[in-house]
């Protein structure tokens, strides 16, 4: 799914209010200090790209997040923001649900959670704005200088 | 627990560079945005910039454009501000800023600041 | 760039009284339905503190005594309470647009 027309200042806001609430729940009592974040994104739809690979694609060692709180909200913004996303995410829906039944909190899913607060910081906060729309520079744009 | 450590005051004269560093500790330095804000004496706070270290994205302060370089190493997780052309306005505490966790975009760590005095 | 304007500049307040600091920024600072507004608290020789993000939500470990409210152009932190460690310079700071910008501060002191 190409990310490039979602409305970003909606899912960032969908993010604040609601979807880092429940990645810090995910995450309590770990420290935030505990897992290095390796994986980065450039633009918010390269962030989204991984977001989204991140959050429903089972990896190795954490088999599936997408049962979790934080992941069926963030299907919802996706779905309401980013037009054309939820027919892309039919085969995708069935995939998952023969995945699996029970949800199990492993340090690998933990360490990939950490990634996703990572990713959703850098959605939330880029540094460079085009002209005349809510997308965002490329990294290799020949300008390249950059609690709760 | 993130900590900012700034480079030691500076004195300077007209005309010339200064180039003040901002080692962070405890803590991931490439995936947060890192700011640099200045404050004259008896006044308030200037952002000058900021910098994404992961792939040195900049964002500068158009005021200090032609001015100012933020830079970033991410082997020794050190952010760094150059202000070149000093004038006697550019006397100022400089502060580094590393943003929050969550994206929200204020900023929950600071340095201690580095005092930089311009004169002749 | 938007400018934000604090009011007072100063204010002398009595320990135990409320004291209410208000910013206005030249055009608004919503966006999506959220107020992209940030309070800090400065005491001298030392960096900036947060007290408040996005208007009204409480920084890590400060006291519920401070709050915060408004939306789009007009904000006001209020100190419910005044205690004698409140007093230093307060300061808003917009990041909805670049460049970021603070108020000029404002200086709170004990009458």
């Known amino acids: 799914y190409d990310f490039t027309n979602c409305d970003f200042e909606k899912i960032k806001a969908a993010y604040l209010s609601t979807i880092s609430k429940d990645l810090i729940t995910y995450m309590s009592g770990t420290k935030s200090t505990e897992f290095n974040n390796t994986v980065s994104c450039s633009n918010r739809p390269h962030c989204l790209t991984e977001i989204q690979s991140l959050t429903f694609n089972p990896t190795a060692g954490c088999a599936s997040l997408a049962k979790e709180m934080f992941a069926m909200k963030t299907k919802a913004a996706l779905a309401i923001w980013c037009p054309g996303y939820s027919e892309t995410q039919i085969n995708a829906t069935q995939a998952m649900k023969k995945a699996r039944k029970s949800k199990v909190t492993t340090n690998k899913c933990l360490e990939q959670v950490s990634q996703l607060q990572g990713l959703w910081r850098r959605f939330n906060r880029p540094l460079l704005k085009q002209q005349g729309s809510s997308d965002y520079k490329d990294d290799d744009d020949k300008h390249h200088h950059h609690h709760h | 627990e993130v900590q900012l450590v700034q480079s030691g005051a500076e004195v300077k004269k007209p005309g010339s560079s200064v180039k003040v560093s901002c080692k962070a500790s405890g803590g991931t330095f490439s995936t947060y945005n890192m700011h640099w804000v200045r404050q004259a004496p008896g006044q308030g706070l200037e952002w000058m910039g900021a910098i994404y270290p992961g792939n040195g994205e900049t964002s500068y302060n158009q005021k200090f454009k032609d001015r100012v370089t933020i830079t970033a190493d991410k082997s020794t997780s050190t952010a760094y501000m150059e202000l070149s052309s000093l004038r006697s306005e550019d006397t100022a505490v400089y502060y580094c800023?590393?943003?929050?966790?969550?994206?929200?975009?204020?900023?929950?760590?600071w340095g201690q600041g580095t005092t930089v005095t311009v004169s002749s | 760039d938007i400018v934000m304007t604090q009011s007072p500049d100063s204010l002398a307040v009595s320990l135990g009284e409320r004291a209410t600091i208000n910013c206005r920024a030249s055009?608004?600072?919503?966006?999506?339905?959220?107020?992209?507004m940030h309070w800090y608290q400065q005491k001298p020789g030392q960096p900036p503190k947060l007290l408040l993000y996005r208007a009204s939500n409480l920084g890590s470990g400060i006291p519920d005594r401070f709050s915060g409210s408004g939306s789009g152009t007009d904000f006001t932190l209020t100190i419910s309470s005044l205690q004698a460690e409140d007093v230093a310079v307060y300061y808003c700071q917009q990041i909805n647009t670049d460049p970021l910008t603070f108020g000029q501060g404002t200086k709170l002191e004990i009458k």
């Open positions: 055009e608004s600072v919503d966006n999506s339905g959220l107020s992209f």
């Open positions: 800023a590393r943003e929050d966790d969550y994206g929200e975009g204020y900023f929950d760590v």
